[in-house]
Amino acid sequence: APTSSSTKKTQLQLEHLLLDLQMILNGINNYKNPKLTRMLTFKFYMPKKATELKHLQCLEEELKPLEEVLNLAQSKNFHLRPRDLISNINVIVLELKGSETTFMCEYADETATIVEFLNRWITFCQSIISTLT
C-alpha cells in the first residue's frame, strides 16, 4: 500500500508536470506567428483511456513530437529550450509511471492539435491530483 510520503511525492511530481504542461499551453496561446498555423496542423495521438499513472506511457511516446513542434516556435514565451523542457517532463513521467511493468499504450482513432493534446494531459494531471488530496 502506498505510504503517505510516497503519495505526497506523487502529488508533487504531478503538480510539477501540470505546471510544465500549463506553461507550454500558455506559451502557445500567447504565440502570434504564421508558424502557429503550421504548429496546429501537427497531429498528436491521444490515449484511448487515461485514468491511471501507467497511462502516462501514452504521453511519454508523444514527447518527442511535442519537442519538434515547440522547436518550430523558437519562442521567448518559454524560459527553457524545448529540449530541456521536454527532458524535464520526461524525467517526471518516467518516475510517475514507473518502469516495473511494460504498458502498451492504446491510442484513440481521432488525432488532436497541440492545444487539445496539452489540455487532455492537463485534465489528466488535475484528475489524479484530486484523487490524491
Epitope: T41, F42, K43, K64, P65, D109, E110, T111
Partner: antibody, heavy 119, light 107 residues
Framework: QVQLQESGPGLVKPSQTLSLTCTVS??????????WNWIRQHPGKGLEWIGY???????HYNPSLKSRVTISVDTSKNQFSLKLSSVIAADTAVYYC???????????WGQGTMVTVSS | DIQMTQSPSSLSASVGDRVTITCRAS??????LNWYQQKPGKAPKVLIY???SFQSGVPSRFSGSGSGTDFTLTISSLQPEDFATYYC?????????FGQGTKVEIK
C-alpha cells in the same frame, strides 16, 4: 531537395515476406517532425496507407495490416524499410515510400516500385 | 475507418473549363483534408493541405475549400497538364484514408 527511392524485389512468392527499402537523399531522416511512410496502390485502384516510422523508431500501422507489417529505420544509412509477411496475390501493388510532416499531408514521394505476388 | 467518397469518379472537360471535384467524409474531419494529383505511372503530388492551403509551387488555378464532412477541389481554368486523377485524403483519424479518385479526361 529531399528525394526518396524505393528498392527491393519485384516478384515475391505467396506466403513469403515482401521486403522493401526506401533511401532518403538530400536531407536527413532524423529531421525533426518528419514521419516516413509506406503507401501502396493496387493496380488501377486507389491508395492505401500502410504505416509510418519516426527516426526515433516509433511506429504506427494501419490496423488492417498491423499483424503482418514491420517498418524499421536505419539512421546511419538514411533508410527505412518495410516488411510484409505471409503475402498473398492481393498484396500485388505499387509500393511508395513518402514523407509527411506532423502526420499530415504526404509532401514527398518516391517514384514507386511494383511488387507482384505470384508463384 | 473513415470512408472518403469522391464525386464524380470521372469527368470529361475541355481546356479552359472550370472543374469541381467533391469529397465527402463519413465523419467530421475538421479541416484535415489534403488533395493530390496523380498522372499515369507517376507518384501522387500534393496540391492542397488542410483543406485550403496551397502546397508551395502549385499553380493558383487550384483551390480547395470545405470543412467538417464536405470538401471541394476547384480548377478554375483547366490546362492540358491538369488531365490526371485526383485523390482526397483525410489526416484526422487513424488510419489515414484516401478517396477512390476522380479521373479528369479530355473531352
Amino acid at each position: 531537395q529531399v528525394q526518396l527511392q524505393e528498392s527491393g524485389p519485384g516478384l515475391v512468392k505467396p506466403s513469403q515476406t515482401l521486403s522493401l527499402t526506401c533511401t532518403v537523399s538530400g536531407g536527413s531522416i532524423s529531421s525533426g517532425g518528419y514521419y516516413w511512410n509506406w503507401i501502396r496502390q493496387h493496380p488501377g485502384k486507389g491508395l492505401e496507407w500502410i504505416g509510418y516510422i519516426y527516426y526515433s523508431g516509433n511506429t504506427h500501422y494501419n490496423p488492417s495490416l498491423k499483424s503482418r507489417v514491420t517498418i524499421s529505420v536505419d539512421t546511419s544509412k538514411n533508410q527505412f524499410s518495410l516488411k510484409l509477411s505471409s503475402v498473398i496475390a492481393a498484396d500485388t501493388a505499387v509500393y511508395y515510400c513518402a514523407r509527411d510532416w506532423g502526420r499530415d499531408a504526404f509532401d514527398i514521394w518516391g517514384q514507386g516500385t511494383m511488387v507482384t505476388v505470384s508463384s | 475507418d473513415i470512408q472518403m467518397t469522391q464525386s464524380p469518379s470521372s469527368l470529361s472537360a475541355s481546356v479552359g473549363d472550370r472543374v469541381t471535384i467533391t469529397c465527402r467524409a463519413s465523419q467530421t474531419i475538421s479541416s484535415y483534408l489534403n488533395w493530390y494529383q496523380q498522372k499515369p505511372g507517376k507518384a501522387p503530388k500534393v496540391l492542397i493541405y488542410a483543406a485550403s492551403s496551397f502546397q508551395s509551387g502549385v499553380p493558383s488555378r487550384f483551390s480547395g475549400s470545405g470543412s467538417g464532412t464536405d470538401f471541394t477541389l476547384t480548377i478554375s481554368s483547366l490546362q492540358p497538364e491538369d488531365f490526371a486523377t485526383y485523390y482526397c485524403q483525410q489526416s484526422h483519424y487513424i488510419p489515414r484514408t484516401f478517396g477512390q479518385g476522380t479521373k479528369v479526361e479530355i473531352k
